[in-house]
């Protein structure tokens, strides 16, 4: 796949990593996570125009078919290519524990 | 994540595997693939409502933040969870070769 990194829609409009500041209340975790109470959530947001950060040949196919049948086949979508781990301190039956989550924060993004 | 498999939007409306019949011309492969001339492309299409086939905790977060900030954070997106391989017979400089592609046909789907 041709993984173009120049966004034809203008700077920052295409699929890329964004940081969203969120409280535990925002995330729906207030009842089971003790700390941190605020999180910098990294996620993949933005458009996936032709040839932009195509993850694989499936993404290429999807774009070609989307052009032909836009009502049937959606454009590729901006999703995490990999994740960063994160620590949450949570309440357990026996007290308090440090817990690592591997699939929580996007590390980088591509179009699928 | 709670991977609900019942679509609250009605049968077939949520993220699932679809088969799209496509020619090599549709796919943009006519100049380098000899066979097959037509492909049953399996791809992931459909909506990702709350708790439906959430791939991981990131998808859960994304949905919660989408509810709060729909203009900033998009809903999770229906993408392949895994792929089926496919063999293409293609032209090479020296003739013809059988080539296996591992990332071409979606095998199953989830929401990320």
């Amino acid at each position: 796949a041709r993984n173009g990194d120049r966004c034809p829609l203008g700077p920052g409009r295409c699929c890329r990593l964004h940081t969203v500041h969120a409280s535990l209340e925002d995330l729906g975790w207030a009842d089971w996570v003790l700390s941190p109470r605020e999180v910098q959530v990294t996620m993949c947001i933005g458009a996936c125009p032709s040839q932009f950060r195509e993850a694989n040949m499936h993404a290429q196919i999807k774009m070609n078919l989307h052009r032909l049948k836009p009502d049937t086949v959606p454009a590729p979508c901006c999703v995490p290519a990999s994740y960063n781990p994160m620590v949450l301190i949570q309440k357990t039956d026996t007290g308090v524990s440090l817990q690592t989550y591997d699939d929580l924060l996007a590390k980088d993004c591509h179009c699928v | 994540a709670r991977n609900g498999d019942r679509c609250p939007l009605g049968p077939g409306r949520c993220c699932r595997l679809h088969t799209v019949h496509a020619s090599l011309e549709d796919l943009g492969w006519a100049d380098w693939v000899l066979s097959p001339r037509e492909v049953q492309v399996t791809m992931c299409i459909g909506a990702c409502p709350s708790q439906f086939r959430e791939a991981n905790m990131h998808a859960q977060i994304k949905m919660n933040l989408h509810r709060l900030k729909p203009d900033t954070v998009p809903a999770p997106c229906c993408v392949p969870a895994s792929y089926n391989p496919m063999v293409l017979i293609q032209k090479t400089d020296t003739g013809v070769s059988l080539q296996t592609y591992d990332d071409l046909l979606a095998k199953d789907c989830h929401c990320v």
Epitope: S35, P85, V87, L98 | -
Partner: antibody
Framework: QVQLVQSGAEVKKPGASVKVSCKAS????????INWVRQAPGQGLEWMGW????????NYAQKLQGRVTMTTDTSTSTAYMELRSLRSDDTAVYYC????????????WGQGTMVTVSS | DIQLTQSPSSVSASVGDRVTITCRAS??????LAWYQQKPGKAPKLLIY???SLQSGVPSRFSGSGSGTDFTLTISSLQPEDFATYYC?????????FGGGTKVEIK
């Protein structure tokens, strides 16, 4: 800027108690936990325990269990560490430190409070 | 409890030298290892977190690497202000633990 300011030095007799304070500023106090770490003269760093400013839940080092109590006062953004039944080997500099954050970072430390236990 | 073993316990080096300190954990803690610098009479200062992330404001001559149980702090070109004691620390699980420290002295 983010700051943790601790109370002044203390001299205590064996068997007594000490209560060290740690006042936070420059961030939302309830968003992070506070660790207490001590350092005996010429020695390394020893973690004593952690408290979440949000709910008061704690996790103490096993060797100090029963002798240490950590509390917070959210109205003044202050954390406290009380150590009872003091012994001479409790003589140390006591630090408060914010964290761990989402990347397990203990990023901001107080200036330290010297506690001397001597008869 | 997770034990952290730091080596060497002390190192003599000159300004401009490359200095490497290692930290070995008794079990996997990837990537939750941090490195601190401490000068006499001062509180520890966070240099590196999550094994390799440079804390804001820390000079780029400091770098961290490693995963699993074996981690390294490297000072690429030692500066006069870098003579201090360095500690590794894990926050993979409670209790949080520290390495024994490495004193970097002037040769």
């Amino acid at each position: 800027q983010v700051q943790l300011v601790q109370s002044g030095a203390e001299v205590k007799k064996p068997g007594a108690s000490v209560k060290v304070s740690c006042k936070a500023s420059g961030y939302t106090f309830t968003s992070y936990g506070i660790n207490w770490v001590r350092q005996a003269p010429g020695q390394g760093l020893e973690w004593m325990g952690w408290i979440t400013a949000y709910s008061g839940d704690t996790n103490y080092a096993q060797k100090l269990q029963g002798r240490v109590t950590m509390t917070t006062d959210t109205s003044t953004s202050t954390a406290y560490m009380e150590l009872r039944s003091l012994r001479s080997d409790d003589t140390a500099v006591y630090y408060c430190a914010r964290g761990p954050g989402q990347y397990a970072d203990v990023d901001v430390w107080g200036q330290g409070t010297m506690v001397t236990v001597s008869s | 409890d997770i034990q952290l073993t730091q080596s060497p316990s002390s190192v003599s080096a000159s300004v401009g030298d490359r200095v490497t300190i290692t930290c070995r954990a008794s079990q996997g803690i990837s990537p939750w290892l941090a490195w601190y610098q401490q000068k006499p009479g001062k509180a520890p200062k966070l240099l590196i977190y999550a094994a390799s992330s440079l804390q804001s404001g820390v000079p780029s001559r400091f770098s961290g690497s490693g995963s699993g149980t074996d981690f390294t702090l490297t000072i690429s070109s030692l500066q006069p202000e870098d003579f201090a004691t360095y500690y590794c620390q894990q926050a993979n699980s409670f209790p949080i633990t520290f390495g024994g420290g490495t004193k970097v002295e002037i040769k």
